[in-house]
């Protein structure tokens, strides 16, 4: 893959801009500078100046003021003012507001429920495989393997609490040491951030909305990945998390506490348990190498059971295997002993849709995965639509000001920390960081919350989920209390360490810059969002997993060159932007590389070819399909409901649209049009919410 998505001639001057680059770029443009931009070394070089901070539009004329795509959109209120309404209008307006609020809460409820069912679906599809990841003995010696197992398992079961509880039970039963568990917890932290990234994909319809939503979601990913990148080697070298948490656990004489309060689950469980109920113990049993569990179904059939303890006679290889010498005898052929067995008597079946279908877990999981994604997408569209109609004019201004404005000087720096606390508190209330960050994603998309404000909220969410884990640990039975508490504290201190690394100093807020960079790339090449998801959450972890299984030598043999190349590219990139003069002429830009290695354009062409079949029949039978359609084929006209793409060739012929001055754009999402992907007249036919 390219070192940077779009690398034209690297500028000798570090203050100039690169289109689509995810590198460090000043936020305020220097209009006196110019930059060369080419996609091909042979192509004539056009002197252009790029828009401020990541804009993908190329402009020839001296620009008048152009909006930064990261600026929040102004939500115009086209309705009649309150004061101008008559009594009947006011009453109607009031009830409309109440109706909207009820609808909003309703869709929000089903949105959260669909997230829960999505998690169940993932567990049904990949839960057993996830459990088997844990039974790999190399975890003990290889922290990198532990990390990727944490990522993969959490991605597969869509729940960090499930993977964490498996780790806790494995530590409690001495199958895993706390030292070996820490990388898995770090991986679980990464894995849990996939949920809101999936939610962000649902907002693919509107480019500007998608840019913000995807960046807002991936800021969580980047925070977690960067934290691990720094803290995993530190932990391996110093074991500071293990030591600190051990000291805390040993210094307190904990008594078993109460269970963490299930505040949101109380509301959602009555509905979700009618859809499906899972026996989560099965995944844990598989992780603990229980052979019988491999054939068990995750779908819970019996909800009311009676457990009867009884003693049975069992044969043993020798008297040494007897439960005790007093419970040991021979029948002349075999040695026998008495074992306590728990006999489970099924009394009442569970009340959910799949209870009598007896379908395999994969089938149930697939059905639920599709349905939950459809509901998730539908609810998200409706939430965005309702919020869009509510948050207009004055209301939007007030909300945006309240959420995004800092405290007055000299307390401005405190705002972010308050946001961290709010994020932690909200996550504690909803008992899930996935739910909180997923609910945040559409708000970032529609422009209610800035990424700069979403970032501390997300960090707070990371803390909130660990406090829930600490409470849950305190409620553990005696034998599991110490291990579960230590693991929960490791999780807590890992997130605290991450915040200390990537938040207090504005300069270190790298996740924001990286997320914005990715947001820009994904807004231009929407397929890249899916590509990013697959690469970071599946391919990289699976590759590391595979290499780890092959042994340390193979892992180091492949890993060291890869890491070396990445570091080399980063150093070169840094030198190109900061002090290019120290580099030889050839290395001052990326033109020495073939186009496919420095630009996403050729890859875009390949993806377009593959999705050509979708482009030609890009029908939108439903508004939900529209999202998938836009994501797959980047079709400009596909989202007029029940209409298909008309004359795509026309859109493709218009590839070389002349570059315009900013005043000719009638949409702030100018990047696509500026790149000549769609005629100007169609700039508003992007996938609208409804």
């Amino acid at each position: 893959m390219a070192p940077w998505p779009e690398l034209g001639d690297a500028q000798p001057n570090p203050d100039k801009y690169l289109e689509g680059a995810a590198g460090q770029q000043p936020t305020a443009p220097d209009k006196s500078k110019e930059t060369n931009k080419t996609d091909n070394t042979e192509a004539p070089v056009t002197k252009i100046e790029l828009l401020p901070s990541y804009s993908t539009a190329t402009l020839i004329d001296e620009p008048t003021e152009v909006d930064d795509p990261w600026n929040l959109p102004t939500l115009q209120d086209s309705g009649i003012k309150w004061s101008e309404r008559d009594t009947k209008g006011k009453i109607l307006c009031f009830f409309q507001g109440i109706g909207r609020l009820i609808l909003l809460l309703g869709f929000l409820y089903f949105f959260v429920c669909s997230l829960d069912i999505l998690s169940s679906a993932f567990q049904l599809v990949g839960g057993k495989m996830a459990g088997q990841f844990f039974s790999n003995s190399s975890i003990m010696s290889n922290p990198l393997l532990g990390l990727v197992i944490g990522v993969l398992v959490t991605v597969l079961v869509q729940s960090s609490s499930t993977s964490t509880s498996i780790v806790v039970s494995m530590v409690s039963s001495s199958l895993l040491t706390v030292r070996a568990a820490i990388p898995i917890i770090m991986g679980a932290n990464i894995g849990t951030s996939i949920t809101n990234t999936i939610v962000a994909l649902m907002q693919v319809g509107d480019r500007s909305e998608f840019r913000r939503a995807f960046a807002g979601a991936t800021v969580h990913d980047f925070f977690n990945w960067l934290s691990v990148l720094v803290l995993l080697p530190v932990e391996v070298a110093t074991h500071y998390l293990e030591i600190i948490t051990q000291l805390i656990v040993e210094s307190f004489h904990f008594k078993n506490g109460e269970d963490a309060p299930d505040l949101l689950k109380v509301i959602t469980k009555p509905f979700t348990k009618l859809i499906v109920q899972l026996d989560k113990k099965v995944i844990s049993q598989i992780a603990m190498n229980d052979e019988k569990a491999k054939n068990k179904s995750l779908v819970k059939i019996w909800c009311k059971t009676f457990t009867n303890k009884t003693q049975i006679n069992v044969t043993v290889p020798s008297t040494a295997n007897c439960t005790s010498p007093s419970l040991c005898w021979t029948d002349g052929i075999q040695n026998w002993t008495m074992k306590n067995v728990t006999y489970k008597e099924n009394i009442a079946k569970c009340q959910h849709i799949f209870v009598n279908f007896h379908l395999p877990d994969l089938a149930v999981g697939t059905i639920l995965l599709i349905l939950s994604l459809l509901v998730l997408c539908g609810c998200l569209i409706m939430i965005v639509k309702i919020l869009g109609s509510v948050l207009k004019g004055q209301v939007a201004t007030v909300i945006k000001k309240t959420i995004n404005t800092d405290f007055p000087f000299p307390f401005a720096w405190l705002t972010g920390y308050l946001a961290i606390l709010v994020g932690a508190g909200m996550t504690f209330i909803v008992q899930s960081s996935s739910v909180f960050t997923s609910a945040l994603t559409p708000l970032i998309g529609i422009g209610v919350i800035t990424i700069e404000r979403a970032y501390p909220l997300t960090l707070g969410s990371n803390i909130g989920t660990t406090t829930t884990a600490i409470l849950a640990a305190l409620a553990s039975p005696g034998n599991a209390l110490r291990s579960s508490l230590q693991i929960a504290l490791c999780h807590f201190f890992f997130n605290i360490s991450g915040i200390l690394l990537w938040y207090p100093i504005p300069f270190t807020r790298l996740p924001i810059r990286m997320a914005k960079g990715l947001g820009n790339i994904s807004a231009k090449y929407r397929w890249f969002a899916v590509f990013y998801l697959i690469i970071f959450f599946f391919l990289i972890p699976l590759t590391v997993f595979g290499l780890s299984l092959a042994g340390w030598r193979v892992l180091v043999g492949v890993g060291v060159p890869v890491v070396f190349i990445i570091i080399l590219v980063l150093c070169l990139r840094l030198l190109q932007s900061r002090c290019p003069r120290v580099l030889p002429k050839k290395l001052q830009n990326w033109n020495f590389l073939p186009l496919w290695m420095r630009s996403l354009k050729p890859w875009d062409a390949v993806v377009s070819k593959f999705t050509g079949c979708f482009q030609m029949r890009c029908c939108c039978c439903c508004r939900v399909c529209c999202r998938a359609c836009c994501l797959l084929c980047d079709c400009p006209k596909c989202c007029r409901c029940s209409k298909c793409c008309e004359d795509l060739e026309e859109a493709q012929e218009g590839q070389d649209v002349p570059v315009k001055a900013p005043e000719t754009f009638d949409n702030i999402t100018i990047s696509r049009e500026a790149q000549g992907e769609v005629p100007a007249s169609d700039s508003k036919t992007e996938c609208t919410a409804l």
């Epitope: 007093s326 005898w329 021979t330 029948d331 002349g332």
Partner: antibody
């Protein structure tokens, strides 16, 4: 009713082999173990070996390992014991008995087969 | 192997007497002990299993007790038909071992 009918008395020379039978009736042959116990004249009982007709599992007392061979014929519900390399001290009454799997007792015994070893 | 020692090796008692036969194991057999009765010219019969449990069809005058290494068979009221040789057998440790027997006679 449960019956274990053993073959008749045998007189053997030292070094020879003897094969005795035990025909079972009145119960499911494969559900029980068949034990062989001997009693030398004026002596106590001595356990020799056992076999499970159901799965063919065998077990021998160390003393008889290699000399005693237990077999079963499920079609006729008959158990056999062959004792080789006979010595004069092998002169005894050989009993077959029925024992329930998992139980350390024999509840029904055969009438015994007298084996006399003399030159 | 576990050695089983019965005492006395023979005893005489009158009809109606309470008779006690003891059996000592060379090591703890954890109550895994049976008692058998062998009448002259008849098949051996199981009387008591697992120290104290009466086999079906056995008169209630027979009882067993004991633990560890010491066990007893008691006939509460001796009857003429009880004339026989009595054997104890342990089944805690492989192989099964029997006591040398106690011969009971009527005075």
């Amino acid at each position: 009713q449960v019956q274990l009918v053993q073959s008749g008395a045998e007189v053997k020379k030292p070094g020879a082999s003897v094969k005795m039978s035990c025909k079972a009736s009145g119960f499911t042959f494969t559900s029980y173990n068949v034990h062989w116990v001997r009693q030398a004249p004026g002596q106590g009982l001595e356990w020799i070996a056992a076999i499970s007709p159901g799965n063919g599992d065998l077990s021998y007392a160390q003393k008889f390992q290699g000399r005693a061979t237990l077999t079963v014929d499920r079609s006729t519900s008959t158990a056999y014991m062959e004792l080789s390399s006979l010595r004069s001290e092998d002169t005894a009454v050989y009993y077959c008995a029925r024992g329930r799997t998992g139980m350390g007792a024999v509840d029904y015994w055969g009438q015994g087969t007298l084996v006399t070893v003399s030159s | 192997d576990v050695q089983m020692t019965q005492s006395p090796s023979s005893l005489s008692a009158s009809v109606g007497d309470r008779v006690t036969i003891t059996c000592r194991a060379s090591q703890d057999v954890y109550s895994y002990l049976n008692w058998y009765q062998q009448k002259p010219g008849k098949a051996v019969k199981l009387l008591i299993y697992y120290t104290s449990r009466l086999q079906s069809g056995v008169p209630s005058r027979f009882s067993g007790s004991g633990s560890g290494t010491d066990y007893t068979l008691t006939i509460s009221s001796l009857q003429p038909e009880d004339i026989a040789t009595y054997y104890c057998q342990q089944y805690n440790i492989f192989p099964w071992t029997f006591g040398q027997g106690t011969k009971l006679e009527i005075k």
